[in-house]
Amino acid sequence: RADPCAARPCAHGGRCYAHFSGLVCACAPGYMGARCEFPVHPDGASALPAAPPGLRPGDPQRYL
């Protein structure tokens, strides 16, 4: 199977980990979100929107 991390799914230097159950992004310092797309504000808050229906923020996201 092709390496799903080769598509570089994680933004802002996030580390992609692939597994048979999906892939996850370990976000670099200062970023958060399923794909590390959101900056963490200095006060620790974030501009993170609500998770899409049926997806909890920490869940692995399946790849095809």
Epitope: R15, Y17, A26, A28, P29, G58
Partner: antibody, heavy 115, light 112 residues
């Protein structure tokens, strides 16, 4: 602010086992690797193994493969490292760290193996 | 396993002078996601390690700007532009591109 809080110091007999815990206080372990690193007195850092809690799969350094088990409990945001068949050579400070960026470290747990 | 080497292993420096530490990996640290997971850690006596630089050259928050990292592929460098007394300790490079993660042997920085 996430912190990694480790269990307290242990004194163990040769041949016994030790289980050290590492709790993410104020946050989640989620998709990071929680690594276990040990440091014998006066020595350098040695990576023992790590787990990605969201997957539940662990990776181990070959040196420790037969003696170490790393687990994680997502419900309590806690990772565990169990080392078996202890000898005096296992006397060390054991750290947990959040990888791949090594941006969070526990304070360390001193494990002393002595008869 | 990827083997990490460092030089020098000991570096006596004069306060206010620069210091440089080299780190080499036995194979490329470029991950399939395009990033290079090479970190620099500082360990002061009696303390846990502390992140200075991640992904070769990104300074961690709160790290003084006298610390900088550079390099690519298999060759990396940590530079301290002007050494201060609080910089005394052991510096480690570490790779997290591939399991098992591995550390360099450490470089001890001391004041002359």
């Amino acid at each position: 602010q996430v912190q990694l809080v480790q269990s307290g110091a242990e004194v163990k007999k040769p041949g016994s086992s030790v289980k050290v815990s590492c709790k993410a206080s104020g946050g989640t372990l989620s998709s990071y690797v929680i690594s276990w690193v040990r440091q014998a007195p006066g020595q350098g850092l040695e990576w023992m193994g790590g787990i990605i809690p969201i997957f539940g799969t662990a990776n181990y350094a070959q040196k420790f493969q037969d003696r170490v088990t790393i687990t994680a409990d997502k419900s309590t945001n806690t990772a565990y490292m169990e080392l078996t068949s202890l000898t005096s050579e296992d006397t060390a400070v054991y750290y947990c760290a959040r990888d791949p960026f090594s941006d969070l470290w526990g304070r360390g747990t001193m494990v002393t193996v002595s008869s | 396993d990827i083997v990490m080497t460092q030089s020098p292993l000991s570096s006596p420096v004069t306060l206010g002078q620069p210091a440089s530490i080299s780190c080499r990996s036995s194979q490329s640290l470029v991950h399939s996601d395009g990033n290079t997971y090479l970190n620099w850690l500082q360990q002061r006596p009696g303390q846990p390690p502390r992140l200075l630089i991640y992904q070769i050259s990104n300074p961690f928050s709160g790290v003084p700007d006298r610390f900088s990292g550079s390099g690519a592929g298999t060759d990396f460098t940590l530079k301290i532009s002007r050494v201060e007394a609080e910089d005394v300790g052991v510096y480690y490079c570490m790779q997290a591109t591939q399991f098992p993660h591995t550390f360099g042997p450490g470089t001890k920085v001391e004041i002359k």
